[in-house]
Interface confidence: low
């Protein structure tokens, strides 16, 4: 008798490993014999597809080598023309041993930054990821976390984080290990022991010590009054990432000695500096404010204002006088916001000659202040309006720093060129005669508070200087 098909063994969920065989069984009772078709995710599986084997009159479907893309719902449908077609469905769950798809790589990182070591995995069930540092499992803490992706994130990297790391991916089917990678922590150069200042007698030997550390170990160079050390012997030793440098000097003149520690991080360098002064006991006259030395001006800001190869006074109350005084000029110019074309060259000349004062070499190098008359010319004539604005801002506390207070001289405290013509310095850029005055527009309605005497004439034009920095 004809009998409609009945599926006697419904399909079940099948778990299969990648590259293994997976079989679905769809046992059917019917008369006449049914036609059985198979679908995966509702798409018909073709009989001639070589990845599958269909046997036992279609009742057995075998996937010959499972791939992870074979995941899905498989259905068999039986029909023999008697009654309706019947269907049974089951899932194929492709199980997969853990696989590390993006392994960690060697990392170099600067101390204090954030490091991320990747470890992206595949697998079913989803693998859990842990990390090994050296030979021990890595313990998470408030800086070190394994992220959901499996990556290892280290905040505020410390020296002790350096070492060998590997990630481990684990599920019920197995374990995968990444190759071992290296985390290298680089540390900016840092001076541990700065050289000490000495006051010695002429002809003494002095040893300056400078100790620095960093990763990689820094190199140490010594600078004497802004130039590479020309005399003296240097001894160095390195132990446990600490470099110790000793500079032995035979003292015949005072000087500023700077120890510079430098190390390299990729394309960038980090440096640390420390300075010491060597003074000679017999030379130290009681001139409290005049601690410094004469040197040629080698900066940029005042290049166009100071005479070529000008000998300027460098104040050793700063650790790095050239840099500090250059910064003072720069800051002062930037803080004088609105400056007229008439005022600008005059202000530049005044600032440069005030901060980099002419230097009188001798037993005690001495700075030569600007003559009062030139200072007043800038204040009351060339820059009257601007000076008022600046003084008002100073009183109202609108400046970001106190630096500008050092940058602008108090004219009344400067020596007059009538007292002693050699005791003060002139500003050649401001020399003018009465004819020149007629060309300037009036800049203040009030009469200058101090009579500005005639300044000596000069054959050079009044404003031959072109500013290196704009003050606007």
């Amino acid at each position: 008798l004809p009998k409609a098909p009945v599926i006697t063994t419904p399909l079940e969920t099948v778990d299969a490993l990648v590259e293994e065989v997976a079989t679905f069984m769809c046992a059917v009772e019917s008369y006449p014999q049914p036609e059985i078709s198979w679908t995966r995710n509702k798409i018909l599986i073709k009989l001639f597809d070589t990845r599958y084997s269909i046997r036992e009159n279609g009742q057995l479907l075998t996937i010959l080598s499972v791939e992870d893309s074979d995941d899905g719902i498989y259905c068999c449908t039986a029909n023999n023309g008697v009654g309706g077609a019947v269907e049974s469905c089951g899932a194929l769950q492709v199980k997969m041993k853990p696989k590390i798809t993006r392994p960690p790589i060697n990392v170099k990182i600067i101390e204090g930054l954030k490091a991320v070591l990747p470890c992206t995995t595949m697998g079913n069930p989803k693998p859990s990821v842990s990390w090994i540092k050296g030979d021990s499992p890595l313990r998470e803490n408030s800086r070190i976390a394994v992220l959901e992706s499996g990556s290892l994130r280290i905040h505020n990297v410390q020296k002790e984080d350096a070492g060998q790391y590997r990630c481990v991916a684990k599920n019920s089917l197995g374990t995968a290990y990444s190759k071992v990678v290296k985390l290298e922590v680089e540390v900016f150069a840092r001076i541990l022991r700065a050289p000490e200042s000495h006051n010695v007698t002429f002809g003494s030997f002095v040893t300056l010590h400078c100790t620095a550390t960093g990763i990689p170990v820094p190199t140490i160079t010594w600078i004497e009054n802004g130039n590479a050390v020309s005399s003296g012997s240097i001894q160095e030793s390195v132990k446990d990432r600490v470099i110790d440098s000793r500079l032995q000097l035979f003292i015949t003149k005072p000087g500023l000695y700077t120890c510079i520690a430098t190390n390299k991080h990729g394309e960038k360098f980090s440096t640390a500096k420390a300075a010491a002064t060597i003074s000679i006991a017999e030379w130290s006259k009681p001139q409290k404010d005049n601690k410094g030395y004469c040197a040629q001006y080698r900066g940029e800001v005042c290049n166009a204002v100071l005479a070529k190869d000008a000998l300027v006074f460098l104040n050793t109350s700063y650790a790095d006088p050239e840099e500090a005084q250059e910064l003072l000029v720069h800051t002062a110019w930037n803080e004088l916001k609105v400056v007229s074309p008439v005022c600008r060259p005059a202000a530049e000349a005044l600032l440069c000659n005030h901060i980099f004062q002419e230097c009188s070499p001798g037993v005690v190098p001495t700075p030569i202040p600007i003559c009062r008359e030139y200072c007043l010319a800038v204040k009351e004539l060339f820059c009257a309006k601007e000076w008022l604005v600046m003084e008002e801002k100073t009183h109202r506390g609108l400046y970001r720093s106190e630096m500008h207070l050092l940058s602008v001289p108090e004219c009344s405290k400067l020596p007059s060129m009538h007292w002693d013509p050699t005791a003060c310095a002139r500003l050649p850029h401001l020399d003018y005669n009465k004819e020149n005055l007629k060309t300037f527009p009036p800049m203040t309605s009030s009469k200058p508070s101090v009579d500005i005497p005639n300044l000596p004439s000069s054959s050079s034009s009044s404003f031959s200087v072109s500013p290196t920095y704009s003050m606007t």
């Epitope: 859990s128 998470e140 803490n141 408030s142 800086r143 976390a145 394994v146 959901e148 905040h155």
Partner: antibody, heavy 118, light 108 residues
Framework: QVHLVQSGAEVKKPGASVKVSCKAS????????MHWVRQAPGQGLEWMGW????????SYAQKFQGRVTMTRDTSISTAYMELSRLISDDTAVYYC???????????WGQGTMVTVSS | SYVLTQPPSVSVAPGQTARITCGGN??????VHWYQQKPGQAPVLVVY???DRPSGIPERFSGSNSGNTATLTISRVEAGDEADYYC???????????FGTGTKVTVL
């Protein structure tokens, strides 16, 4: 918008347990530690511990070891703090807090008042 | 365990500068964070990693840290700055977070 929203106030008897929840939104919950901090009335802040929502790893302050359990449910981006064997000194506001990319706590829950009274 | 000590209270007139200290053994080697807490509210981070400010925190709040003392400075103090302030560090040796004792800032 990043938010941590905590469960409502609780009143418990001494010896009982309390479980406070903290639901995160606006950021990847599993990417950052969740900390718990408490503050007794008129007192300062006291750190209780943290949980790594991804791995479930925890670290508890010595004082609460054995009494506190921190758990999480990543499917609903929620962290839990359970404190057992309550005493009256546990009366406090309990906060959850997290640090999104920095080691400080830059996001806090609104706090949950837990009162322990017989 | 690591201890952070703060003065219980600091009083300051509007427009003046308030300085709150946080003392701890060699605290200069640690990152210090500062929180402001107003009555009935959750704490708010005002300075982290010694001197960095989260977005939205005024420039009037600044921090420094060296030796055995960290300092939170509030310049040009306003009435709205009246609150409790807490310092906090992560103690590497115990892997625990530690809060300071707290300082009440009163604007006169």
């Amino acid at each position: 918008q990043v938010h941590l929203v905590q469960s409502g106030a609780e009143v418990k008897k001494p010896g009982a347990s309390v479980k406070v929840s903290c639901k995160a939104s606006g950021y990847t919950f599993t990417g950052y530690y969740m900390h718990w901090v408490r503050q007794a009335p008129g007192q300062g802040l006291e750190w209780m511990g943290w949980i790594n929502p991804y791995s479930g790893g925890t670290s508890y302050a010595q004082k609460f070891q054995g009494r506190v359990t921190m758990t999480r449910d990543t499917s609903i981006s929620t962290a839990y703090m359970e404190l057992s064997r309550l005493i009256s000194d546990d009366t406090a506001v309990y906060y959850c807090a997290s640090g999104l990319g920095i080691s400080a706590f830059d996001i806090w829950g609104q706090g949950t008042m837990v009162t322990v009274s017989s | 365990s690591y201890v952070l000590t703060q003065p219980p209270s600091v009083s300051v007139a509007p427009g003046q500068t308030a300085r709150i200290t946080c003392g701890g053994n060699n605290i200069g080697s640690k990152s210090v964070h500062w929180y402001q807490q107003k009555p009935g509210q959750a704490p708010v981070l005002v300075v982290y990693d010694d001197s960095d400010r989260p977005s939205g925190i005024p420039e009037r709040f600044s921090g420094s840290n060296s030796g055995n003392t960290a300092t939170l400075t509030i310049s040009r103090v306003e009435a709205g700055d009246e609150a409790d302030y807490y310092c906090q560090v992560w103690d590497r040796s115990s892997d625990h977070y530690v809060f300071g004792t707290g300082t009440k800032v009163t604007v006169l």
